[in-house]
C-alpha cells in the first residue's frame, strides 16, 4: 500500500435493479483492477420528494475525481442522480450530498443507505 | 477481457441523424464512464463527450453541444451516441473507449455523411 | 479547453530513441498529472500505452516511456522498432468534472 493512501479492495455492493440486471441485491463487491490503477466505490441514489432510493453501490475504475476522497459526497447541484465515490474500503457506506454551487450553508445531512 | 463491440458503418443524408451503439463486455459496465471520440478521414482524433454509466450523468464537448445525446441502457451494458443534423464535415470513424483514461477502445463505425 | 500541441512528425532509426513532446498550459498538463499517450497505427483504433504522465499500461514495452516538465509532456521511445512506426497522440483524462482534449497527433516514421 502507497503511504497516505487509502487503498480500496472492497466496496458495499447494492443494485435495485437486480432482478432486470441479474446481479445479487446486496453485499460486499471485491473490486479488482490493473496494476498501476487505483480502485474507488461509488453510490448512486434519487432524491425523490425528500425519500433518499438507492439505485446501486459498488466498484468505480480510476477516476482521478474520486483521488484522496475518504468521504462519498456529491458536489453537483441538483443532479437528476445523484452519484459519489470514494476511496477505501467500503467507503460508499455513508453517503451525502453537499453542492457546491449553494451560496447558503448547505442543511445536507450524511444519508446512511437502508435497503428498501 | 474487456470488449466494447460497436454497430456497423452507416450512410446518412445531410440533416439526418445517426445513432451509434458500443456493447461492453469482460467488466461491469457500471464501474466507470463511456467516453466518445471521433477521428475524420485523415485527421486527428477528437473528444465528443462522455456519459457516467452508472448515473447517466453526461459531459459534451461545446462543439457538439445541442447536437450530440448520450444515453446508456445498463441492463443491455450498452453506450449509445446519437449524432443529430448532420453534416457531411461530419463523416468520420466514431469510436467509444471505457473510462477516464480510454483504456479500452471499440473497433469503431464509420459514419459517411453525403447526399 | 484547447488542444494540445504536439509536433505533426518525427523519424528515428531502428535502435535510436526519439521523444514526442505534448504542450499544454499551467491549467491543463502544467497543473495535473492527469496527461495519457496513445499509439495508433493505420486502419486500427487507439491503444493506451501511458497514463497519468508515466504509468505504462500492462503488456505495453518498457522502451516506452512518459515524462512531464513544467506546460509540456513528453513521450519517449528507446531501441526504435520498425513496428512502432505509427501515429502518436496526447490527451487528458476526461469523466465528471473533467474535459477531454488531445494533442494533434504526430506521425513517428522509422527510417
Known amino acids: 500500500a502507497i503511504l497516505g493512501r487509502s487503498e480500496t479492495q472492497e466496496c458495499l455492493f447494492f443494485n435495485a435493479n437486480w432482478e432486470k440486471d441479474r446481479t445479487n441485491q446486496t453485499g460486499v463487491e471485491p473490486c479488482y483492477g490493473d496494476k498501476d490503477k487505483r480502485r474507488h466505490c461509488f453510490a448512486t441514489w434519487k432524491n425523490i420528494s425528500g425519500s433518499i432510493e438507492i439505485v446501486k453501490q459498488g466498484c468505480w475504475l480510476d477516476d482521478i475525481n474520486c483521488y484522496d476522497r475518504t468521504d462519498c459526497v456529491e458536489k453537483k447541484d441538483s443532479p437528476e442522480v445523484y452519484f459519489c465515490c470514494c476511496e477505501g474500503n467500503m467507503c460508499n457506506e455513508k453517503f451525502s450530498y453537499f453542492p457546491e454551487m449553494e451560496v447558503t450553508q448547505p442543511t445536507s445531512n450524511p444519508v446512511t443507505p437502508k435497503p428498501p | 477481457q474487456v470488449q466494447l463491440v460497436q454497430s456497423g458503418a452507416e450512410v446518412k443524408k445531410p440533416g439526418a441523424s445517426v445513432k451509434v451503439s458500443c456493447k461492453a463486455s469482460g467488466y461491469t459496465f457500471t464501474s466507470s464512464y463511456i467516453n466518445w471520440v471521433r477521428q475524420a478521414p485523415g485527421q486527428g482524433l477528437e473528444w465528443m463527450g462522455t456519459i457516467n454509466a452508472v448515473s447517466g450523468s453526461t459531459s459534451y464537448a461545446q462543439k457538439f453541444q445541442g447536437r450530440v445525446t448520450m444515453t446508456r441502457d445498463t441492463s443491455i451494458s450498452t453506450a449509445y451516441m446519437e449524432l443529430s443534423r448532420l453534416r457531411s464535415d461530419d463523416t468520420a470513424v466514431y469510436y467509444c473507449?471505457?473510462?477516464?483514461?480510454?483504456?479500452?477502445w471499440g473497433q469503431g463505425t464509420l459514419v459517411t455523411v453525403s447526399s | 479547453q484547447s488542444a494540445l500541441t504536439q509536433p505533426a512528425s518525427v523519424s528515428g532509426s531502428p535502435g535510436q530513441s526519439i521523444t514526442i513532446s505534448c504542450t499544454g498550459t499551467s491549467s491543463d498538463v502544467g497543473s495535473y498529472d492527469y496527461v495519457n499517450w496513445y499509439q495508433q497505427h493505420p486502419g486500427k483504433a487507439p491503444k493506451l500505452m501511458i497514463h497519468?504522465?508515466?504509468k505504462r499500461e500492462s503488456g505495453v514495452s518498457n522502451r516506452f516511456s512518459g515524462s512531464k516538465s513544467g506546460n509540456t509532456a513528453s513521450l519517449t521511445i528507446s531501441g526504435l522498432q520498425a513496428e512502432d512506426e505509427a501515429d502518436y497522440y496526447c490527451?487528458?483524462?476526461?469523466?465528471?468534472?473533467?474535459?477531454?482534449?488531445f494533442g494533434g497527433g504526430t506521425k513517428l516514421t522509422v527510417l
Open positions: 497519468g504522465v508515466s
Open positions: 473507449a471505457r473510462g477516464g483514461w480510454f483504456d479500452y
Open positions: 490527451g487528458t483524462f476526461a469523466g465528471g468534472s473533467y474535459y477531454g482534449v
